[in-house]
């Protein structure tokens, strides 16, 4: 890939004396940007979902929505659940900060998450009884 | 009223068949996804089968797959429960339980059960 | 296979708050129900969709699911409450729908 030029000035990752912590500005910068416009398609899917919300003050960002899948099955155009195919969770890795120690205000570590964003239809796993 | 009732249970020898009924009254029968759960005497509840609202799709156990078959009539709103090849294990009571039109994980209805008896 | 650990039981004494834990990996991506069962009676369902209280299920019940427990909760527990408590859920790579082995209930 093409490495983006870094100031002179920065210090190198290798040196012994690297930060192991930085300073992160918690106020987002385009935080009033409108997103894609909310979407119904947890409805409208063949593998429905609600979404949840996730709060844990030790957090941040503290409150992170998350999608449960409504059915085991696929629903069909006229709504109603086939078990031939199954609905599952689509999982993404996300970075969140964790304060440590606890209930610190401004001392952040990285930890990564597994969050559910929406669910989709899937082919089951097939399995043979002996 | 709203009601499921079983009947078909008895005691029959291992290696045997047996065949269990559930009368629906009250409801849309027809637009449930219908369930059998079992529970040895003083054991858990362990859920069985299912059929889907039209009885295209059914999913099992693995410890009845091959043995027992789920079907439903729903012309006559019934489901039933044929069970082959049984076993010591499967004694159990029985139970049909209407899954929730809101998603599987709820069993919004059950009916009173009936007791199979497994054993020579 | 996938596995919800209820504990066998659990006392309370009358008007106080009964816990009744249901432990799965990552219990919190699924839903959870519970049901209420007296001895020489069919299950009653009495919380679905980890939150959600179908009518007729008195309003002293209630339920929460996060990380890997969901809790059944039964405030101002009466005589009548005491039961066997079971969670469901269903795990999508065994396609089967999975049951806790239950916690009985005593009203003290």
């Known amino acids: 890939g093409i490495a983006s030029p870094q100031n002179p000035g920065c210090p190198n990752a290798e040196d012994k004396n690297f930060p192991r912590t930085v300073m992160v500005n918690l106020n987002i910068r385009n935080r009033n940007t409108n997103s894609k416009r909310a979407s119904d398609y947890y409805n409208r899917s063949s593998s429905p979902w609600n979404l949840h919300r996730n709060e844990d003050p030790e957090r941040y960002p503290s409150v992170i929505w998350e999608a449960k899948c409504r059915h085991l099955g696929c629903v069909d155009a006229d709504g109603n659940v086939d078990y031939h195919m199954n609905s599952v969770p689509i999982q993404q890795e996300i970075l969140v900060l964790r304060r440590e120690p606890r209930h610190c205000t401004n001392s952040f570590r990285l930890e990564k998450m597994l969050v559910s964003v929406g669910c989709t239809c899937v082919t089951p796993i097939v399995r043979h009884v002996a | 009223q709203v009601q499921l009732v079983e009947s078909g249970g008895g005691v029959v020898q291992p290696g045997r068949s047996l065949r269990l009924s559930c009368a629906a009254s009250?409801?849309?029968?027809?637009?449930?996804?219908m369930h059998w759960v079992r529970q040895a005497p003083g054991k858990c509840l362990e859920w069985v089968t299912l059929?889907?609202?039209?009885?295209?799709?059914?999913l099992y156990g693995d410890s009845v797959k091959g043995r027992f078959t789920i079907s439903r009539d729903n012309s006559k709103n019934s489901l039933y429960l044929q069970m082959n090849s049984l076993r010591a294990e499967d004694t159990a009571v029985y139970y049909c339980a209407r899954g929730s039109v809101r998603g599987e994980a709820a069993f919004d209805l059950w009916g009173q059960g009936t007791l199979v008896t497994v054993s020579s | 296979s996938y596995e919800l650990t209820q504990p066998p039981s659990v006392s309370v004494s009358p008007g106080q708050t009964a816990s009744i834990t249901c432990s799965g990996d990552?219990?919190?991506?699924?839903?959870v129900s519970w049901y209420q069962q007296k001895p020489g009676q069919s299950p009653v369902l009495v919380i679905y969709q980890d939150t959600r209280r179908p009518s007729g299920i008195p309003e002293r019940f209630s339920g929460s699911n996060s990380g890997n427990t969901a809790t059944l909760t039964i405030s101002g527990t009466q005589a009548m409450d005491e039961a066997d408590y079971y969670c469901m859920t269903w795990d999508v790579d065994t396609t089967s729908m999975i049951f806790g082995c239950g916690t009985k209930l005593t009203v003290l």
């Open positions: 009250g409801f849309a029968f027809g637009s449930y996804t």
């Open positions: 990552n219990l919190r991506t699924k839903y």
């Open positions: 059929i889907s609202f039209d009885g295209r799709s059914k």
